[in-house]
């Protein structure tokens, strides 16, 4: 039909973006690239009805349903959702297309359903139907990938039993150390399940779906590398597959590799060998040790020996249940305002943990780095010198771990005073928490040197009053000081600040501010 307009239906996903630590929070919206919902004419329907592809949205996600209309002249429109009419404001883009949008902020169950858009143009009337549902992520899983040998081939298959079906990729690197970081140019990614090139330095398999990304590294002993100072350790849970690769390079083919478990040769069917010549005509051999489903008795020292290289071992520990080992005692730190400082947690865990750092009810990404001694470390440096409690939380399939840190920033106290009919109070946010003195100013003591000790009540670390650590001191008013100026001073190792208040009862209380370094 020549009169029908050209229309395009798109979905714009928004992500909540907030990266700054702060005293409070608001979340500016950031748009993702639009996804075409391919509006198609609905057959056998009365009138012209276009139907967009069904839209599945995560709970609390924010989206925009958008229609682009390529039709001459003005258009008018109306949204209908659950029998209610919703306001519709079309506008025109740079290509002079009519644009109609419906923004759904923080998706909830009540916002799921059919959204009907009625459009009236100079040429024709038509309806566009969007069906929006909440994605059922309760059934979603993302499992760490594991390896299997491909039947009758020298190749590894990477398997991740996840829902929805994950995208599996091999991440390969032929350099050493730091240059094998994820975004390094030395890293090659192959989006396939089967890998034939098994001679690389570093081989990982990763699986990703809507829940994120999980990776497994092929545990490797390289006989040409100097052994680590501590024995490499590999943890596995009962029933998981074991894969260890032993790799060696020699000037010619005249060498062989063998695997032993606790000085006994591995049984036939628990290893396979591959070899190739490298570019400089040296021979590379690899020997895989594998057990398709480990039991407790597979624990022990696995040693790879060569007729031309010193042998190297790894300790394989089979556990019934995953674990996270780290000291969970809380730690307090005290730093200067511009001192560089990072929190850090050292832990040993299996399976690999997922972790977050939290401050002031806001979570921050957590990076972990493996150390040579089998431990991992996570650091958090993005505290922006804000005092308070920081929480490290880690979990894996079987264990959870939480560690608390307190950060105090050394600073000279500030003082803020207030007075009521019966008392005067002073507050300070200095750290170390300050000590207090009260002095009476009179004719006899114009410099306010007469110390007041009666009726003073100090409170340490009352964090209520200003949403941060605050020390306070209260002076109960007595007849002896009514009508006088009094001075409260807070002092710590970094300095002193004072504020002077007139104890005038009843009525308002003026003040004079002093500052003494």
């Amino acid at each position: 039909n020549q009169d029908l307009p050209v229309i395009k239906c798109v979905l714009i996903n928004h992500k909540n973006n907030d990266s700054s630590v702060g005293k409070s929070s608001s979340y500016p919206m950031v748009s993702e690239s639009p996804e075409d919902l391919g509006c198609a004419l609905r057959p056998q329907s009365s009138g012209t009805v276009y139907e967009a592809a069904a839209v599945e949205v995560d709970v609390s996600a924010s989206i925009t349903l958008q229609v682009l209309v390529d039709a001459p002249g003005n258009i008018s429109c109306l949204w209908v959702f659950k029998h209610s009419s919703l306001n519709c404001q079309p506008h025109f883009d740079l290509q002079n297309r009519g644009v109609v949008s419906m923004v759904i902020l923080k998706m909830t169950e009540t916002q799921a359903g059919e959204y009907l858009l009625f459009i009236q143009s100079e040429a024709t009337n038509y309806t566009i139907l969007f069906t929006v549902s909440i994605r059922n992520t309760l059934l979603y899983t993302l499992r760490r990938p594991y390896f299997r040998k491909m039947e009758n081939q020298d190749a590894l298959v990477c398997i991740s039993e996840s829902v929805p079906e994950p995208i599996v990729e091999w991440v390969l690197c032929d350099s050493q150390g730091e240059s094998c970081k994820e975004e390094s140019p030395a890293v090659v990614k192959k989006e396939e399940k089967v890998l034939h090139e098994l001679f690389g330095t570093d081989i990982r398999c990763c699986a990703r779906n809507e829940l994120g990304r999980e990776c497994t590294r092929l545990f490797t002993i390289d006989l040409n590398q100097t052994p680590q100072t501590t024995l490499p350790q590999l943890f596995l849970k009962v029933g998981e597959p074991l894969w260890i690769r032993c790799k060696a390079v020699h000037v010619n083919h005249g060498f062989g590799l063998t695997w032993e478990l606790e000085n006994k040769a591995l049984e036939e069917g628990n290893y396979f060998e591959m070899s190739t010549y490298s570019t400089n005509r040296t021979m590379i051999r690899i020997l895989f040790a594998f057990v398709s489903s480990v039991a407790r008795n597979d624990t022990g020292y696995y040693t790879c020996s060569s007729s031309k290289h010193p042998s190297q071992s790894a300790l394989v520990t089979i556990v019934e249940k995953g674990f996270i080992n780290a000291t969970n005692s809380s730690e307090d730190y005290e730093i200067d305002q511009y001192e560089e400082f990072c929190f850090s947690v050292r832990f040993k865990a299996y399976p690999q943990i997922r972790c977050t750092w939290t401050f002031s009810r806001k979570s921050f990404p957590c990076e972990q780095k493996g150390l040579d001694n089998g431990y991992s470390i996570s650091k958090f440096c993005n505290h922006k010198h804000q005092p308070g409690e920081y929480i490290f939380h880690a979990e894996n399939d079987d264990a959870q771990f939480t560690k608390m840190f307190t950060l105090n920033i050394r600073r000279k106290p500030q003082v803020l005073a207030e007075a009521s009919a019966s008392q005067a109070s002073c507050f300070s946010d200095g750290y170390p928490l300050p000590s207090w003195t009260w002095k009476k100013c009179s004719d006899k003591s114009p410099n306010c040197t007469e110390e007041i000790t009666e009726g003073v009540w100090n409170r340490k670390a009352n964090r209520k009053v200003f949403g941060q650590w605050v020390s306070s001191s209260t002076l109960n008013m007595s007849e002896a000081i009514k009508g006088f100026l009094v001075k409260c001073c807070a002092y710590n190792s970094l300095g002193t600040s004072c504020e002077t208040i007139l104890l005038n009862s009843p009525g308002p209380f003026p003040f004079i501010q002093d500052n003494i370094s």
């Epitope: 803020l416 009521s420 200003f466």
Partner: antibody, heavy 118, light 107 residues
Framework: QVQLVQSGAEVKKPGASVKVSCKAS????????ISWVRQAPGQGLEWMGW????????NYAQKFQGRVTMTRDTSTSTVYMELSSLRSEDTAVYYC???????????WGQGTLVTVSS | DIQMTQSPSSLSASVGDRVTITCRAS??????VNWYQQKPGKAPKLLIY???SLQSGVPSRFSGSGSGTDFTLTISSLQPEDFATYYC?????????FGQGTKLEIK
């Protein structure tokens, strides 16, 4: 979310008093001080004083001493600022602001315009 | 009272420009300086507290520096929504005092 909602605009005659309210929500009312800051038309910001909603204690800027009274009602999470003996130079927008630190103002009310005119 | 003097009092700039506003205190105030943005008919909004700490939700193009008596607010790449009046404020001692403001206009 944190909100400070102020009462509506007022027109007063010189010598009269005005009482502006500021209702707090979205946080623990007694945990943060409330300051009042005013802004005359086309001018800068001027601090008037603060109240501790926990104790009701106050501290006023010298300039407003004797003319300003700040009170609070913890049952409704509302702070009040009363300014007496009004003169034409008191024509301004009056803001209440939450004290996120001892003297930093992290959330502000929308402002109340007080016009003093004979 | 501590006087806070801002400069310039107004400035014209274009989207994408890097802009710096300075504030000088009449006495040393350590790092107790806050910066606010105010748009016509609206309440001020806290951008930066304690000289350099970015208030939550404020874009990272805003930054602050300084100590003692001299402080700066920098906007690394001006956006259309940044055209407004900016105020510095000392939170060192009572009474807290504000600068006279810097009006940032579109060139």
């Amino acid at each position: 979310q944190v909100q400070l909602v102020q009462s509506g605009a007022e027109v007063k005659k010189p010598g009269a008093s005005v009482k502006v309210s500021c209702k707090a929500s979205g946080y623990t009312f007694t945990s943060y001080g409330i300051s009042w800051v005013r802004q005359a038309p086309g001018q800068g910001l001027e601090w008037m004083g603060w109240i501790n909603p926990n104790s009701g204690g106050t501290n006023y800027a010298q300039k407003f001493q004797g003319r300003v009274t700040m009170t609070r009602d913890t049952s409704t999470s509302t702070v009040y600022m009363e300014l007496s003996s009004l003169r034409s130079e008191d024509t301004a927008v009056y803001y209440c602001a939450r004290q996120g630190g001892l003297r930093d103002f992290d959330y502000w009310g929308q402002g109340t315009l007080v016009t003093v005119s004979s | 009272d501590i006087q806070m003097t801002q400069s310039p009092s107004s400035l014209s700039a274009s989207v994408g420009d890097r802009v710096t506003i300075t504030c000088r205190a009449s006495q040393s105030i350590s790092t107790y300086v806050n910066w606010y943005q105010q748009k016509p008919g609206k309440a001020p909004k806290l951008l930066i507290y304690d000289t350099s700490s970015l208030q939550s939700g404020v874009p990272s193009r805003f930054s602050g520096s300084g100590s003692g008596t001299d402080f700066t607010l920098t906007i690394s790449s001006l956006q259309p929504e940044d055209f407004a009046t900016y105020y510095c404020q000392q939170s060192f001692i009572t009474p807290p005092t504000f600068g006279q403001g810097t009006k940032l206009e579109i060139k």
